[in-house]
């Protein structure tokens, strides 16, 4: 922490400008008025302050706004945003997409995933829902950031907005997030023809249930292996060898490469070996011929 001293007369600060570059930490602490700093935040980013100096300026703002910064200050944080912790950001109320854009630009190239996730969360809360303008801003300025939102926040996405989401925006989404987004996508694209529908729904299929995957297998979609590997394990296990063959079409040969990886490995263990042999891929690990399969979980549920 910077020690408190009185400001020497020749160091008194009347405006935030480049003359502050060579101030020591204790001089900044003593001589910069927090209200002046807040009023002239838009100037800070043009001045080559060091990490240490930015720490002092942040401390000033923290003292002035213990409950969280106003958006007029947040919008102009610039590189000072890199000093913020998720705890700091949780105190903010952000509604402006211009603020979001400005801070997303600053965070680019820095390890700020936790801060960015919290910022986006605050924007969604501030705006009341994840509307089209917010999604457009995220996809333009922060590909992949959509997946930083919790399933709860994603549930506020109206289906009409789903069309603005690009495949690369979902690359880092986990199963719980896709579970929320998939039904919305299904609704959003329901009026599309088979092939067009598949192209649109494909990035969301990590959230699809078994019955929808089974339905796709009847539509000659030729699902690529990358998409298949992202399907929920629970959605893949009940599929028959015939259904998987129809689902993948010419891509079925890729199963051999993924033989040891989930969900393919788990699916193989559930299939009869002679069914797997019909694929001619040399897949091993299926249930040997003549063995009975007892599903104990069903019996336990009945007792």
């Amino acid at each position: 922490d910077v020690e408190r001293t009185t400001c020497p007369p020749e160091k008194e600060v009347h405006e935030i400008d480049e003359s502050l570059i060579f101030y020591k930490k204790r001089e900044l602490e003593a001589c910069v008025d927090a209200a002046l700093l807040a009023a002239q935040m838009d100037r800070v980013d043009a001045i080559p302050f060091t990490y240490e100096q930015l720490d002092v300026l942040k401390h000033k703002l923290d003292e002035l706004y213990p409950q969280g910064y106003p958006e007029s200050v947040i919008r102009h944080l610039g590189h000072l945003f890199l000093k913020m912790s998720p705890e700091d950001i949780r105190k903010w109320n952000v509604t402006s997409l211009e603020t979001l854009k400005a801070l997303l630009k600053v965070s680019k190239g820095h390890e700020m995933s936790a801060q960015v996730a919290t910022l986006i969360d605050r924007v969604v809360v501030g705006r009341g829902q994840l509307d089209k303008d917010t999604v457009d801003t995220l996809t333009a300025f922060c590909p992949g950031c959509l997946c930083s939102l919790s399933p709860e926040r994603l549930s506020s996405v109206p289906p009409s907005v789903i069309g603005a989401v690009r495949p690369q925006d979902l690359d880092t989404c986990g199963p719980r997030q896709l579970d929320v987004l998939y039904p919305k996508a299904r609704l959003a694209f329901q009026n599309m023809s088979g092939s067009e529908y598949f192209v649109k729904i494909r990035p969301f299929l990590g959230g699809a249930p078994t019955e929808d995957v089974k339905a796709l297998s009847q539509q000659n979609v030729s699902m690529d292996l990358a998409t298949f590997m992202k399907l929920r394990r629970e959605a893949v296990l009940p599929l028959t060898v015939a259904e998987v063959q129809k689902l993948l079409g010419p891509h079925v040969e890729g199963l051999k490469v993924e033989e040891q990886h989930s969900p393919v490995r788990d699916w193989i263990l559930k299939q009869r070996q002679d069914d797997l042999d019909t694929l001619g891929l040399g897949l091993q690990g299926g249930i040997p011929n003549g063995y009975l399969i007892l599903d104990l979980s069903v019996r336990e549920a009945l007792s």
Partner: antibody, heavy 119, light 106 residues
Framework: EFQLQQSGPELVKPGASVKISCKAS????????MNWVKQTNGKSLEWIGI????????SYNQKFKGKATLTVDQSSSTAYMQLNSLTSEDSAVYYC????????????WGQGTTLTVSS | QIVLTQSPAIMSASPGEKVTMTCSAS?????MYWYQQKPGSSPRLLIY???NLASGVPVRFSGSGSGTSYSLTISRMEAEDAATYYC?????????FGSGTELEIK
């Protein structure tokens, strides 16, 4: 060991531009601001400007605004100074110099780059 | 901008002799910095924040002063101290250097 290695001497014609480099090693380049200083005829020193290697923000002595442009390349830990519209007045030795922690002086200097502007 | 006037411009001292040079600022400054430069070499930081010795600088060097008047002292002159010494301020923007004091060995 901390080191600031500058590019070699330059002989250029009036009206031309030149870009001098300063490669940092032995410390975290983005943690310290970099300054540029001009020394004419082995006499006194003039501060040209300063750049923050982390953000690329810079500030200039009014006298050198429009004459000097400071940039950095983080990937190679190198600071650059471009001087344009050169005249004989720009002939000098130019130094890069790192600012110490909490503005405790220019603690490390490059070896200097001699610029001669002559037709 | 603040003008720093160094005096004397040139001086000489015998080995073992005490040497004092001054730097006068046109306006009050908070700190003074001192650099040593030998012919063909870069400046080297000697004193920072008026009186603190930079890393590797011999203890025979010391700095003092406040306001507009500052000084650099060498308690016992050695041959290797022959050089030009510059004061520098950055309390006021832009940073400025003095015109230098050239110290010769007698």
């Amino acid at each position: 060991e901390f080191q600031l290695q500058q590019s070699g001497p330059e002989l250029v014609k009036p009206g031309a531009s030149v870009k001098i480099s300063c490669k940092a090693s032995g410390y975290s380049f983005t943690d310290y601001n970099m300054n540029w200083v001009k020394q004419t005829n082995g006499k006194s020193l003039e501060w040209i400007g300063i750049i923050n290697p982390n953000y690329g923000t810079s500030s200039y002595n009014q006298k050198f605004k429009g004459k000097a442009t400071l940039t950095v390349d983080q990937s190679s830990s190198t600071a650059y100074m471009q001087l344009n519209s050169l005249t004989s007045e720009d002939s000098a030795v130019y130094y890069c110099a790192r600012v110490g922690r909490d503005n405790s002086g220019f603690d490390y200097w490059g070896q200097g780059t001699t610029l001669t502007v002559s037709s | 901008q603040i003008v720093l006037t160094q005096s004397p411009a040139i001086m000489s001292a015998s080995p073992g002799e005490k040497v004092t040079m001054t730097c006068s600022a046109s306006s009050s400054v908070s700190y003074m910095y001192w650099y040593q430069q030998k012919p063909g070499s870069s400046p080297r930081l000697l004193i920072y924040d008026t009186s603190n010795l930079a890393s590797g600088v011999p203890v025979r060097f010391s700095g003092s002063g406040s306001g507009t008047s500052y000084s650099l002292t060498i308690s016992r002159m050695e041959a290797e101290d022959a050089a030009t010494y510059y004061c520098q301020q950055w309390s006021s923007y832009p940073p400025t250097f003095g015109s230098g004091t050239e110290l010769e060995i007698k």
